[in-house]
């Protein structure tokens, strides 16, 4: 499916706890509101114009796997995040990894397997 402007749909789903997008082409992920109540977001086998700069205050689990496009990681603001799976995206990540990349100090699980070049230049400060 190709979803060009689906913010109206997202706004209707602001209070669901889990949300999954599979095999979707989507350009406007940064239109997600910080206030959305999602606790678990799954983006699998989707196509993005750029890495989605997610900003979601309630999100605890993010599964972002096997996606195409947006090959450079850019920071997200997910203050409640505990679980992050970024595997199999062909991502390059210059300067992994610090609290400031994810906007959280709560991270317990991080999977960066099967990606591109991951350059480690921080010692997981704030993610201990």
């Amino acid at each position: 499916y190709y979803l060009d402007d689906i913010i109206d749909l997202f706004n209707c789903l602001t209070n669901v706890s889990s949300f999954s997008l599979v095999s979707v082409t989507i350009e406007r992920v940064k239109d997600f509101s910080y206030n959305f109540g999602w606790q678990h977001l799954e983006l699998v086998n989707c196509k993005f114009g750029q890495f989605p700069t997610l900003k979601l205050k309630s999100l605890k689990r993010l599964t972002f796997t096997s996606n195409k496009g947006g090959n450079a990681f850019s920071e997200v603001d997910l203050p409640s995040l505990e679980f992050l799976d970024l595997s199999r995206n062909g991502l390059s990540f210059k300067g992994c990894c610090s609290q400031s990349d994810f906007g959280t100090t709560s991270l317990k699980y991080l999977d960066l397997s099967f990606n591109g070049v991951i350059t480690m230049s921080s010692n997981f400060l704030g993610l201990e």
């Epitope: 910080y34 900003k55 603001d77 210059k94 610090s98 609290q99 990349d101 350059t119 400060l125």
Partner: antibody
């Protein structure tokens, strides 16, 4: 507590290069966040100039891209601004700031006034 | 670039009055809008993030609302110490941009 402190000459001649340094205490700049320069001409609003990410990546306001350089010295925990070919319109209070993940600025230096005049 | 237009430019208000400052974006920015207070000869201070989320330590009389293109900063029951210039800033896209500012004066 993170603190930022700008320093540099308060007077620069037209066509010269403006050079400022921001000393950071309370957080190692090589371990996280991005570190920004923002300026404010006297009596006017704020203009974002550019930043250096903790990885060393830099990005700038397109309006300044041909004249601006931002670098860092992690051993001194400081980052620097250079702005070339300055004119009177570059007269401003220059602030350094730390941006959080959500593209906002919780931490600012106190600012330093730079006047461009012969 | 995203242009932020603030209104009014200037407001003269008596203590305990309610102040409303608006910020309009040239395109939709979801809720990626932040507010700052700047007192004379001081650096800006973050008041509100993401349109409506108060920063720790900021008095509860400051509140924000809005989404998309239209945003509001409200100061309920203005106090003398609130005399300052207030700026909005969008974090939706680079280059990051600020509104032109609203100066609030105490009558």
């Amino acid at each position: 507590q993170v603190q930022l402190q700008e320093s540099g000459p308060g007077l620069v001649k037209p066509s010269d290069t403006l050079s400022l340094t921001c000393a950071v205490s309370g957080y190692p700049i090589r371990f996280g966040y991005s570190w920004h320069w923002i300026r404010q001409p006297p009596g006017k609003g704020l203009e974002w100039m550019g930043y250096i990410h903790y990885s060393g990546y830099t990005d700038f306001n397109p309006s300044l891209k041909t004249r601006i350089t931002i670098s860092r010295d992690t051993s001194k925990n400081q980052f620097s601004l250079k702005l070339s070919s300055v004119t009177a319109v570059d007269t401003a209070v220059y602030y350094c700031a730390r941006k959080d993940s959500g593209n906002y600025f919780p931490y600012w230096g106190q600012g330093t006034l730079v006047t461009v005049s012969s | 670039e995203i242009v932020l237009t603030q209104s009014p430019d200037f407001q003269s208000v008596t203590p305990k009055e309610k102040v409303t400052i608006t910020c309009r974006a040239s395109q939709s920015i979801s809720d990626h809008l932040h507010w700052y207070q700047q007192k004379p000869d001081q650096s800006p201070k973050l008041l509100i993030k993401y349109a409506s989320h108060a920063i720790s330590g900021v008095p509860s009389r400051f509140s924000g609302s809005g989404s998309g293109t239209d945003f509001t900063l409200t100061i309920n029951s203005l106090e003398a110490e609130d005399a300052a210039t207030y700026y909005c800033q969008q974090g939706y896209d680079f280059p990051l941009t600020f509104g032109g500012g609203t100066k609030v004066e105490i009558k």
